[in-house]
Amino acid sequence: SEVEYRAEVGQNAYLPCFYTPAAPGNLVPVCWGKGACPVFECGNVVLRTDERDVNYWTSRYWLNGDFRKGDVSLTIENVTLADSGIYCCRIQIPGIMNDEKFNLKLVIKPAKVTPAPTRQRDFTAAFPRMLTTRGHGPAETQTLGSLPDINLTQISTLANELRDSRLANDLRDSGATIRIG
């Protein structure tokens, strides 16, 4: 089953996905799509990177992190209820049936009038750790634990604060991460 993430209408949603490049600058193509990960590609592609850059994106979908270091987490700007659903992050590792795929479920809730709660600083709790297991064909994703009610205000605020900080590695290691090479 998919890992669940939540956001409120009008917020930016954050869907974590990471990989570790085999060597600096040795990037792997990645695609994000709306809908569960099919056998190839990403369903309806909303954003794509190649070996060098983000080479395709649609409005409201962007990468806030340093994708050159493998942070390919997706930010969806100003979400509406229509943004609810499953999203696919696919790491397109070259070779025979090497792709890694992650299904992430985004639940959009109506905006609350109450003030945002205290920010969460327990990064490993805020981002469920993912384990990938190899089998025949693309790897399946299992979760070792998740907090379905985590407030995405906390996550998007933290993501902004941590963009250039040394704590980014903590964040990276607690998301959907694969290592290449």
């Epitope: 099919p38 190839f40 590609e41 369903g43 309806n44 395709y56 693309p138």
Partner: antibody, heavy 122, light 107 residues
């Protein structure tokens, strides 16, 4: 008009090799995944292999991946299937098919070639 | 592997009939399902992709529905040229798999 034309089929002895080709025209070849699908005489359809846009990723039916190799040459708008150690059960019509495009969305083999018959027999 | 099971295996019907063919996947394939029509000696032709989207040039009497594990192909009013074999195929898991086919014959 989209066209896929297979060639290279024929009669081959068990243990032999054959290389199938598929010439594509009428679309931007490098924007699509491509596939080979086969059909044994009087039987149903069986997927064989797929290849991504630039040939860097390939996907196979597990039982065939040690003997078959899919490849492409985007400069020549061509798809290939190298078949080694052929067996009687590989006898089939082999179809080249266009699969999903660069932006996803349409999951189905939208265009097919006319097929080329491979017969493995002594 | 995801198994695709079509029913019925064969079907006799008359011109003008409404015909339904079903396809069941052994696992959730969301909407990654295609339907093909094949006539003897010819290559298959895509009818429906993503479970319900009509392929280019396909008559509107063909329609697809379903998601998850259960899918249906409906021909609202059979025409003489519709007598053929129909296959479903999933694009969700590797390996890609087809149903065993449904042969539609003239009654």
């Amino acid at each position: 008009e989209v066209q896929l034309v297979e060639s290279g089929g024929g009669l081959v002895q068990p243990g032999g090799s054959l290389r199938l080709s598929c010439a594509a025209s009428g679309f931007t070849f490098s924007d699509y995944y491509m596939a080979w699908v086969r059909q044994a005489p009087g039987k149903g359809l069986e997927w064989v292999a797929n290849i991504n846009y630039d040939g860097s990723s390939t996907y196979y039916l597990d039982s065939l991946k040690s003997r078959f190799t899919i490849s492409r040459d985007n400069a020549k708008n061509s798809l290939y299937l190298q078949m080694n150690s052929l067996r009687a059960e590989d006898t089939a019509v082999y179809y080249c098919a266009r699969d999903v495009g660069y932006y996803g969305g349409n999951y189905g083999f939208a265009y097919w070639g006319q097929g080329t018959l491979v017969t493995v027999s002594s | 592997d995801i198994q695709m099971t079509q029913s019925p295996s064969s079907l006799s019907a008359s011109v003008g009939d409404r015909v339904t063919i079903t396809c069941r996947a052994s696992d959730n394939i969301y909407s990654y399902l295609a339907w093909y029509q094949q006539k003897p000696g010819k290559a298959p032709k895509l009818l429906i992709y993503n479970a319900k989207t009509l392929a280019e040039g396909v008559p509107s009497r063909f329609s697809g529905s379903g998601s998850g594990t259960d899918f249906t192909l409906t021909i609202s009013s059979l025409q003489p040229e519709d007598f053929a074999t129909y296959y479903c195929q999933q694009h969700y898991g590797s390996p890609l798999t087809f149903g065993q086919g449904t042969k539609l014959e003239i009654k």
